[in-house]
């Protein structure tokens, strides 16, 4: 019996270390700036990267530029997005800008697209200053199910600040779905 | 048989409640406004309370000024930092402020620092105004390893606001490494 | 023997998912801008949504624009505030302005409220801009005992962004306390 | 006070090089500041051509980019336009201007350039 | 590229006389216009910033307003000084383009 009771100990431990590591899926996605969109209008961003550096990614998919949902569950999301301009690169077409994130989710199944959580500022980047800079940060609480695409929307891409720490998204999943 | 069943289940609730108590470090560390450095460079911040108030940490340890993680496995990492001054304080060096926070980790067997996320803006603080305030959030999800270490760096060190609830940063454990 | 152990397996793995799901409370709250407080002054917002759309609840309570916490634990706090004006809603009392989210814990037990968690920016919002926005994001690791009560503060109520993935706060439980 | 000055051929033939150079005198046109050639067609519309910077980075109209290019002379305070394969359709006054708090606020008098065979 | 269309083509006044003339938008710009005037056989001159921001050594009797898409340049009670032609330019986005103008003329 005793003997049994360590098998069951055993497998329980196995079972559950198992298990909880499936039951958690997972990503963190930082920028691609090999491929960011020109202008001042709102884009998707669809290129991220997923296995370097900060990047990376368990349980979940990337792909065609959105984090695709494998497992049901509620996931705690957020987006970290940084805009950036040096007066070395460039004029900018208006110094009245609108610097924003959308974070959606997109359903395959009833093709809809809505946005989870937005945030960003107004900002005045006068030529009067040499460097300028702006993050926005975003978190929250949802529900994902299989097959559920998230993807980043941002205006003015082409101000977007390129390195790993500064611009990237991600999930983890917190807990099942009763 | 069903005594042992009893206390396999015992013995399993214990195990279970324990083994996810030990599973999940975290920490939440707030300001120690004694010891904040002046000047309008780039700092690390290393005085922080971790047992007062709202700071608290367990399953990891505060040293030198950095929190140091004791365990393996996937963290959120988050930090709030909150920028002040108010006329009475006496006047800006400039008007022309960058704002900014660095969340930095330090691995001690290769010795490296690597910033893990970065946040802030440019601001222009004029004198037009009596109060001046401005705050940084920034979170994300990474894999961390035991002796690896977390801090904190700021610019305008002696800009910030001291309160519990302005200026903290933390980590908790999410998952463990596969 | 093998049959108590399927027995203890099947039980065990009920419990551990039953235990698991209860022991996770969440929320995510949303704001009812259907009576949203006019003024510029800080007020307590009491109207959020709970059951519609992004917001949900589990195993805690929303009560008298509160967020009760039902279940002790250490909690994963978190607020998005977008505020906005458009030259078509009229002038603005002044084009300084203090935006800012105050995120409170107020213990019935012994009456008292204390500032978990705050943020935002002072705001020159002036009449050469059609349009303003600016977003605050907070979000900390608090411990919470049953009984406990969350709730949101702002200054300048009426120039929140009514939308559902604008204005929200919310709580997920990450751990027990020892 | 800023001032600027076009020249260059009056005349190009279709399927040449247009060259203006503009002469910028009362400021450096390497401290800060962009810019600019634009130009006006026979019956007085606007077209923003391309600029470039102080730091020496460019920006051209899409409409004209493969046949576009700015360039600067630093030591004589001038920068340069020059566009190629050209057509009766490029006929037009050429200005350059310079542009601040994102308005164009000197300009050149322009200098009238005919594609003609 | 952003499509600037202002009307009327031409304007025939007589000095004294308050005149409005309009510039339409492709696409919501904000407030991110300006107005140029260009007397003939010279080059334009910057007259109003960010669709009603004042320029330093223009006369007070010009103004902008307007958002979005739709803008308008006034001029309160106008001078002789004033014919010539009046183009809008956006810089919401590059390419910078301009409206092909309102011509001013004496009735």
């Known amino acids: 019996i005793r003997a049994e009771k360590a098998m069951v100990d055993g497998s329980w431990l196995d079972l559950a270390k198992r298990s909880k590591l499936e039951a958690q899926p997972f990503a963190h996605l930082t920028i691609n700036a090999t491929n960011i969109p020109t202008g001042s209008h709102k884009v998707s961003l669809s290129s991220w990267y997923h296995d370097r550096g900060w990047a990376k990614i368990s349980n979940m998919t990337f792909s065609n530029g959105k984090l695709i949902v494998n497992q049901d569950g509620f996931y705690y999301l957020y987006a970290n997005i940084c805009f950036r301009h040096h007066e070395t690169s460039g004029d900018l077409a208006t110094e009245y800008l609108q610097l924003m994130v959308y974070v959606t989710k997109t359903s395959i199944k009833i093709p809809s697209s809505h946005t989870l959580m937005k945030g960003g500022s107004t900002k005045y980047w006068s030529g009067n200053s040499e460097f300028h800079f702006y993050s926005i940060n975003v978190g929250g609480f949802f529900k994902l199910r299989s097959g559920e695409e998230i993807s980043v929307e941002v205006s003015n891409p082409s101000l977007l600040d390129p390195d790993q720490d500064a611009t990237y998204f991600g999930a983890f999943k917190v807990r099942d779905i009763d | 048989i069903r005594a042992e069943k009893a206390m396999v289940d015992g013995s399993w609730l214990d195990l279970a409640k324990r083994s996810k108590l030990e599973a999940q470090p975290f920490a939440h560390l707030t300001i120690n406004a004694t010891n904040i450095p002046t000047g309008s460079h780039k700092v690390s911040l290393s005085s922080w309370y971790h047992d007062r108030g709202w700071a608290k940490i367990s399953n990891m340890t505060f040293s030198n000024g950095k929190l140091i993680v004791n365990q393996d496995g996937f963290y959120y990492l988050y930090a709030n930092i909150c920028f002040r001054h108010h006329e009475t304080s006496g006047d800006l060096a400039t008007e022309y402020l960058q704002l900014m926070v660095y969340v930095t980790k330090t691995s001690i067997k290769i010795p490296s620092s690597h910033t893990l996320m970065k946040g802030g803006s440019t601001k222009y603080w004029s004198g037009n105004s009596e109060f001046h305030f401005y705050s940084i959030n920034v979170g994300g999800f990474f894999k961390l390893r035991s002796g690896e270490e977390i801090s904190v760096e700021v610019s305008n060190p002696s800009l910030l606001d001291p309160d519990q609830d302005a200026t903290y940063f933390g980590a908790f454990k999410v998952r463990d490494i596969d | 023997i093998r049959a108590e152990k399927a027995m203890v397996d099947g039980s065990w793995l009920d419990l551990a998912k039953r235990s698991k799901l209860e022991a996770q409370p969440f929320a995510h709250l949303t704001i009812n801008a259907t009576n949203i407080p006019t003024g510029s002054h800080k007020v307590s917002l009491s109207s959020w949504y709970h059951d519609r759309g992004w917001a949900k609840i589990s195993n805690m309570t929303f009560s008298n624009g509160k967020l009760i916490v039902n279940q002790d634990g250490f909690y994963y706090l978190y607020a998005n505030i977008c505020f906005r004006h458009h030259e078509t809603s009229g002038d603005l009392a002044t084009e300084y302005l203090q935006l800012m989210v105050y995120v409170t814990k107020t213990s019935i037990k012994i009456p008292s409220s204390h500032t978990l968690m705050k943020g935002g920016s002072t705001k020159y919002w002036s009449g050469n801009s059609e349009f303003h926005f600016y977003s605050i994001n907070v979000g900390g690791f608090f411990k919470l005992r049953s009984g406990e009560e969350i709730s949101v503060e702002v200054s300048n109520p009426s120039l929140l962004d009514p939308d559902q993935d604008a204005t929200y706060f919310g709580a997920f439980k990450v751990r027990d306390i020892d | 006070d800023v001032q600027l000055q076009e020249s260059g051929p009056d005349l190009v033939k279709p399927s040449q090089s247009l060259s203006l150079t503009c002469t910028v005198t009362?400021?450096?046109?390497?401290?800060?500041?962009?810019w600019h050639w634009i130009r006006q067609f026979p019956g007085n519309k606007l077209e923003w051509m391309g600029y470039?910077?102080?730091?020496?980075?460019?920006n051209y109209n899409p409409s004209l980019k493969s046949r576009i290019s700015i360039t600067r002379d630093a030591s004589k305070n001038q920068f340069f336009l020059q566009l190629s394969s050209v057509t009766t359709e490029d006929t037009a006054t050429y200005y350059c201007?310079?542009?601040?708090?994102?308005?164009?606020?000197?300009w050149g008098q322009g200098t009238l350039v005919t594609v003609s065979a | 590229d952003i499509v600037l269309t202002q009307s009327p083509a031409t304007l025939s006044v007589t000095p004294g006389d308050s005149v409005s003339l309009s510039c339409r938008a492709s696409?919501?710009?904000?407030?991110?216009l300006h107005w140029y005037q260009q007397k003939s056989h010279e080059s334009p001159r910057l007259l109003i910033k960010?669709?009603?921001q004042s320029i330093s050594g223009i006369p007070s009797r010009f103004s902008g307003s307007g958002s979005g898409t739709d803008f308008t340049l006034s001029i309160n009670s106008v001078e002789t000084e004033d014919f010539g032609i009046y183009f809008c330019?956006?810089?919401?986005?590059?390419?910078?383009?301009f409206g092909a103008g309102t011509k001013l003329e004496l009735k």
């Open positions: 201007a310079t542009r601040r708090e994102t308005g164009f606020t000197y």
């Open positions: 009362g400021y450096s046109i390497t401290s800060a500041y962009s």
């Open positions: 470039i910077h102080f730091s020496g980075v460019t």
């Open positions: 696409q919501s710009i904000s407030k991110n």
């Open positions: 960010y669709a009603s």
């Open positions: 330019q956006q810089i919401n986005s590059w390419p910078l383009t």
